[in-house]
Interface confidence: medium
Amino acid sequence: KLTIESTPFNVAEGKEVLLLVHNLPQHLFGYSWYKGERVDGNRQIIGYVIGTQQATPGPAYSGREIIYPNASLLIQNIIQNDTGFYTLHVIKSDLVNEEATGQFRVYPELPKPSISSNNSKPVEDKDAVAFTCEPETQDATYLWWVNNQSLPVSPRLQLSNGNRTLTLFNVTRNDTASYKCETQNPVSARRSDSVILNVLYGPDAPTISPLNTSYRSGENLNLSCHAASNPPAQYSWFVNGTFQQSTQELFIPNITVNNSGSYTCQAHNSDTGLNRTTVTTITVYAEPPKPFITSNNSNPVEDEDAVALTCEPEIQNTTYLWWVNNQSLPVSPRLQLSNDNRTLTLLSVTRNDVGPYECGIQNELSVDHSDPVILNVLYGPDDPTISPSYTYYRPGVNLSLSCHAASNPPAQYSWLIDGNIQQHTQELFISNITEKNSGLYTCQANNSASGHSRTTVKTITVSAELPKPSISSNNSKPVEDKDAVAFTCEPEAQNTTYLWWVNGQSLPVSPRLQLSNGNRTLTLFNVTRNDARAYVCGIQNSVSANRSDPVTLDVLYGPDTPIISPPDSSYLSGANLNLSCHSASNPSPQYSWRINGIPQQHTQVLFIAKITPNNNGTYACFVSNLATGRNNSIVKSITVSA
């Protein structure tokens, strides 16, 4: 069937439309287009004869139409008047006629809209605002946007006038937003520029900050006032009802008790004409005296003396507080407070009790701190340490030994070689040493204040050749899967290579084996029973190489899950039951048996002669290793048939 399709159906003014013909019959003589829904010679637009390919304009031809051989009609520069129906009249070669009608609609291109408002400065909770989208356009749809979102549902929002007018009733400050309107028709959509609604509000009740109302004499009073308001509020301050100044901040330096009173902030909005006030009551307290600490012993001796610290001055009905190292007092049997907390006593002082100590006096407003006090605890000397730790030196080098002992006041040092006093210095230096410098080197540390003295003796051997090394261990009986063991090759010597062997082989690569301290220390992490091997260390320098005697690691393990033998579980009445329990364990475990949950004997072997069906049941072997603290067990069912 002959049909007409309009492309597009909705046409913008000034654009073009194609009336496209479908299912055109064959053997045609020609065809004509007409404006309207019927064939009317007065409204013919154009005719076309196929044989001559001749197009003939009709009375309704505007010069904007083009006809194509396939009968389609193109209309250019569309005007509003072009809206409507178009009829195609087809004349076939047999002079039989056929007709088809199509249509399209013409719409104007919309201009960019704008928003007009009936109130540019509405007052909150009082005014309404009506926004109107301009211009008014026929056949246009109107839409509204708030902050680029579609209109929220609200009883205070109302659309009217074909959605062209948006009314906000009883505006609030939250209506301060970006408003846009949009016009749409079938051929265009345009959005207006934003209009920001400027809602006048406030002032709200002002807030005075800071919130604290108690001050100390001598401080500065700095109050700030703020009230939500549009336009911003104008502020005034009143003290005890008397006007002070028209500023947002009130500043009074170096206040006294006389500055106590009621402080009022008034906020005024000149546009809304509203005023709001807030009152705060300020109390100024007199300055209490700054506390200080007195001590009954300025130089106490460690582990001998007690010290009593007292917080001065004594004030009636006052709370005294104490701090040590900027922390509240720790719980300790060596710390005692008097009933009024004014005196803190340290019993048997230690070097860790130096402090600093602070006391505080609490008043209505705050806590006043004393200056910190540090105790001068006399201690030591501890056993001196001689460094470096080498015991072997090669001839020709310089020997430089340093001695240090923890002590207050610092220790005085003396050096002795083979019992003979050398010098009173902390360091001993001997250049170009020989074998004759081998001997016992003693460092003596003396504390003149406590009168105590301590010594450390170090054997030094001067030899190019190293001695036979030995292995020291930090754990002689490590527990499997729990402990680590550190072997150290002794002695420590300069310019020495340290080597290790396990069972006569060089060290295997293992994440559980770690060398440190210049290879002098071998650490086994998370030992296993397989680590129970012979460990040998070697030392090597330019002229010697020696190995230690082997040290066998005794790894404690188990007990593993025990095994009961023989494996049989069925016996004949009258037979002897002889069960043996074994569990891998180091040291050997303790064994015990239970039959049907009842404890029996503490032996590895359970023997019952001439068993009967009464001996049916569960036989449990329990193993425990006292060294590892671990236990294990296994249960076996025994059946005795008559």
């Epitope: 020989t434 074998e435 050749e465 036979k468 006569g504 330019s542 190489a545 190995r547």
Partner: antibody
């Protein structure tokens, strides 16, 4: 296995100098020290000194200070002994010697010796 | 330097006989080492660090001593033991050898 291969015999004129080599196989010379020892005809052993091939540190017996110079070439695993201002007193067999603990034993390795003859 | 004096200079022993060679140091040393040398060959370590048997050395060899006095003992002489034996100290520089003791088979 470990071996120390020394260079061949040398006949040197009095006042001249000579450079002897000792090439190690089976171990890296940087991991040990190389000592040099000499033995005069029908005489005992004399320690000349040693070198640490890793850093070139040397130690000489006072008698050989200025007479002997030790060097190494770690890329070829070779130690060298240079002798200068030679006299008939320096006629001897020169040995290189390396000692190291391996496993539970201490091994002491010697080269086969290089005979140096100083002629007038 | 530390001078090592070996004695005797020459010793003859029959197979199965016990042989002792001594080495005296002019200054105390921490250990002594002993070498064996046969004609036309390089020295070979037999005892290290006073009393330790070097690899491949028969158990009939032993060493002892301390301070300035050390000795090497062969419990039962065998023909293959005929050689010159040197002591060596490594406690101080320069390292020194003894003049040697020639052990002959009787």
């Amino acid at each position: 296995q470990v071996q120390l291969q020394q260079s061949g015999a040398e006949l040197v004129k009095s006042g001249g100098s000579v450079k002897l080599s000792c090439t190690a196989s089976g171990f890296n010379i940087k991991d040990s020290y190389m000592h040099w020892v000499r033995q005069g005809p029908e005489q005992g052993l004399e320690w000349i000194g040693h070198i640490d091939p890793e850093n070139g540190d040397t130690e000489y017996a006072p008698k050989f200070q200025g007479k002997a110079t030790f060097t190494t070439d770690t890329s070829s695993n070779t130690a060298y002994l240079q002798l200068s201002s030679l006299t008939s007193e320096d006629t001897a067999v020169y040995y290189c010697n390396e000692g190291t603990p391996t496993g539970p034993y201490y091994f002491d390795y010697w080269g086969q010796g290089t005979t140096v003859t100083v002629s007038s | 330097e530390n001078v090592l004096t070996q004695s005797p200079a020459i010793v003859s022993a029959s197979p199965g006989e016990k042989v002792t060679i001594t080495c005296s140091a002019s200054s105390s040393v921490s250990a002594m080492h002993w070498f064996q040398q046969k004609p036309g060959t390089s020295p070979k370590l037999v005892i290290y660090s006073t009393s330790n048997l070097a690899s491949g050395v028969p158990a009939r060899f032993s060493g002892s001593g301390s301070g300035t006095s050390y000795s090497l003992t062969i419990s039962r002489m065998e023909a293959e033991d005929a050689a010159t034996y040197y002591c060596q100290q490594r406690s101080s520089y320069p390292l020194t050898f003894g003049a040697g003791t020639k052990l002959e088979l009787k």
